[in-house]
């Protein structure tokens, strides 16, 4: 594939990544799939600056990110190491709360109204953020 050198229309460039901010809501799996179809992934937060950048753009609204523990341990969707990486959980979170009455616990992470993270039921229809790296090769076939 060819290397992407600029962000697609309606995406925002920041520190060699492109970001797309939804204005509607989807379940985490649907949001994840949406980003994959755009040759991107749900946002992976790796630094204070990236946290602040995303927080600025989403405002005080619950928004999915690319972090989940549906298979046991917490994992970032792009393979970034969770244990050694940036974390910004709200106090007492993640708590895998079962008291919501929707079945199961809470396996997907989202930004809360103050930017800090919470785990929640993956079926909730929250907004989401897609991210793709500018220097990575796109999956589109090269134009002949």
């Amino acid at each position: 594939g060819s290397e992407r050198t600029c962000c697609p229309v309606n995406w925002v460039e920041h520190e060699r990544s492109c970001y797309w901010f939804s204005r509607s809501g989807k379940a985490w799996a649907d949001a994840d799939n949406y980003c994959r179809l755009e040759d991107a992934h749900l946002v992976v937060v790796t630094s204070w600056e990236e946290q602040k950048f995303v927080q600025h753009h989403i405002g005080p609204v619950n928004t999915w990110m690319g972090l989940h523990d549906q298979n046991g341990p917490w994992k970032w969707v792009d393979g970034t190491d969770y244990e050694t990486g940036f974390k910004n959980w709200r106090p007492e979170q993640p708590d895998d709360w079962y008291g919501h009455g929707l079945g199961g616990g809470e396996d997907c992470a989202h930004f809360t109204d103050d930017g800090r993270w919470n785990d929640d039921v993956c079926q909730r229809p929250y907004r989401w953020v897609c991210e793709t790296e500018l220097d990575k090769a796109s999956q589109e076939p090269p134009l002949l």
């Epitope: 204070w48 600056e49 602040k52 600025h56 974390k87 910004n88 959980w89 106090p91 930017g115 800090r116």
Partner: antibody
Amino acid sequence: QVQLVESGGGVVQPGRSLRLSCAASGFTFSSYGMHWVRQTPGKGLDWVAVIWHDGSNKYYADSVKGRFTISRDNSKNTLYLQMNSLRAEDTAVYYCARDDPRSSAGDYWGQGTLVTVSS
Amino acid sequence: DIQMTQSPSSLSASLGDRVTITCRTSQSIFNYLNWFQRKPGKAPKVLIYTASSLQSGIPSRFSGSGSGTDFTLTISSLQPEDSATYYCQQSYSIPLTFGGGTKVEIK
């Protein structure tokens, strides 16, 4: 009401160590990040370090990295700053401040403790 | 590191005057700009956070504006108790950095 009280300041020789404490009350200490900020004599404010509410992240100013360590004991409602290899330019009033998660500004500050590094 | 250029470094104004202090950053910080007031022998106090939000308990004569790299603190009608040094601070990037301060005196 929110109260932050720093202690542990004093006169120390260059190269020596000092540990500052900040006792917090009037709020749920374990729910807030905390900063250390210093005011050098006749000069401005200088951010030193921040620690997350659960200690999961710690960040430092370049001028103190490798010499100072920020830590906290949530069971004691206390924030610490371990200062090693002190230099004359570390002379300052040291303040602890509570972090506002929306802005990362210090929304409440202590009265400060004076550290003087001199031979 | 993000550099903070605050101006003026000092000013003298009369009671009731409108006072404006500016802060310019070396790169965009979106709206992560906070304003503090410091009086001798007292702890610094946050006035404005995220560029324009008034901190609880702060008089409404204080206001903030700006985004990106250019920010302003305005005191709409200077009062005796406003004699102090004012600092801007960016909280977008580590290390957090402060401006050099503006000393406000009453004529």
